[in-house]
């Protein structure tokens, strides 16, 4: 036997108090799928949260964060404080990146500068709290007699057109 509630569309609920007829979701609630026996409470976007999308009878509200804060978690469940570039957020607030680390965003943690020597390269531009180091050519490439001319592009095989 088919469940009579399965006929209730999104935006309604199957009302047990009224012979299982489909009743519209009350204000401040929604059902995003059919066959629901209750409607879910709409999320409120207040305080540090702002409404990005209003709640409707078939979909929940969506929030984002007020300026100076950014979303964290599924569906922007939390708002975390922005920091400046060159800082990271700690339990005590925004703190400058330690020497040898950088953060080029308003969120996230300070990350170590790239170690150019691991790739056999030299440091072309020093790192700062806000920017990573820029690695240059390997020291061998900079030794006397090393050509600084860009090598020619490899020759194409005959009969092949450019990609």
């Amino acid at each position: 036997l088919q469940d009579p509630c399965s006929n209730c569309p999104a935006g309604t609920f199957c009302d047990n108090n009224r012979n299982q007829i489909c009743s519209p979701c009350p204000p401040n609630s929604f059902s995003s799928a059919g066959g629901q026996r209750t409607c879910d409470i709409c999320r409120q976007c207040k305080g540090v949260f702002r409404t990005r999308k209003e709640c409707s009878s078939t979909s929940n509200a969506e929030c984002d964060c007020t300026p100076g804060f950014h979303c964290l978690g599924a569906g922007c469940s939390m708002c975390e404080q922005d920091c400046k570039q060159g800082q990271e957020l700690t339990k005590k607030g925004c703190k400058d990146c330690c020497f040898g680390t950088f953060n080029d965003q308003k969120r996230g943690i300070c990350r170590p500068w790239t170690n150019c020597s691991l790739d056999g390269k030299s440091v072309l531009v020093n790192g700062t709290k806000e920017r990573d180091v820029v690695c240059g050519p390997s020291p061998a490439d900079l030794s006397p007699g090393a050509s600084s001319v860009t090598p020619p592009a490899p020759a194409r095989e005959p009969g092949h057109s450019p990609q």
């Epitope: 409470i41 409120q44 949260f49």
Partner: antibody, heavy 118, light 111 residues
């Protein structure tokens, strides 16, 4: 379950600053609003202000010039400072957790009585 | 002076149904859900109803809430002597970006 406990002086002199702390136990301070509410003897509940765990604050306009709320997530505490006290600030002061989905104050401290008198 | 308006007192006899009203404006009740709190003398308020009509676990189904326009009401059916307390309505106010309370209704259970 989550419990809140207010602490601070019971008696403060006029013109001085009241400092109260609310300690959150049995749960995290993250992802909620933390509010201060007061109730003068025989009178209404009055919202003082709130702080979101990540530092966002808002205050009752009638008290804004005198109030500061701060949070210490490492200690699971938040604090109230109210300056330039008068006898009208005599009240029971409550801290409360405000849910960040439906915004009901679902957990309250037991309250601390503050008397402003010389 | 509270932003939300409640009657200062209400009363009923055991078994009766009583309602407590709460009136606001478009910036609070008109645009936001209403919460209700119960407070016994010398204790902190307790959340009784949230989001207009939702009961936290442990709250008896004798308590119900509703909202229409810029007004809300709390209904208590099958009144019991232990329901004698103060009841406060509260709603977020968009102009404050914070909550506002009613001044409370003292419920007396007669007899």
């Amino acid at each position: 379950q989550v419990q809140l406990q207010e602490s601070g002086p019971g008696l403060v002199k006029p013109s001085e600053t009241l400092s109260l702390t609310c300690t959150v136990s049995g749960g995290s301070i993250s992802s909620y609003y933390w509010s201060w509410i007061r109730q003068p003897p025989g009178k209404c509940l009055e919202w003082i202000g709130y702080i979101y765990y990540s530092g966002y604050t808002n205050y009752n306009p009638s008290l804004k010039s005198r109030v500061n709320i701060s949070v210490d997530t490492s200690q699971n505490q938040f604090s109230l400072k109210l300056n330039s006290l008068t006898a009208a600030d005599t009240a029971v002061y409550y801290c409360a957790r405000t849910h960040s989905y439906y915004y009901g104050m679902d957990v309250w401290g037991q309250g601390t009585t503050v008397t402003v008198s010389s | 002076q509270s932003v939300l308006t409640q009657p200062p007192s209400a009363s009923g006899t055991p078994g009766q149904r009583v309602t407590i009203s709460c009136s606001g404006s478009s910036s609070n009740i008109g645009n936001n859900p209403v919460n209700w709190y119960q407070q016994f003398p010398g204790t902190a308020p307790k959340l009784l109803i949230y989001s207009n009509n939702q009961r936290p676990s442990g709250v008896p189904d004798r308590f119900s809430g509703s909202k229409s326009g810029t007004s809300a009401s709390l209904a208590i059916s099958g009144l019991q002597s232990e329901d004698e307390a103060d009841y406060y309505c509260e709603a977020w106010d968009d102009s404050l970006n914070g909550p506002v309370f009613g001044c409370g209704t003292k419920l007396t259970v007669l007899g």
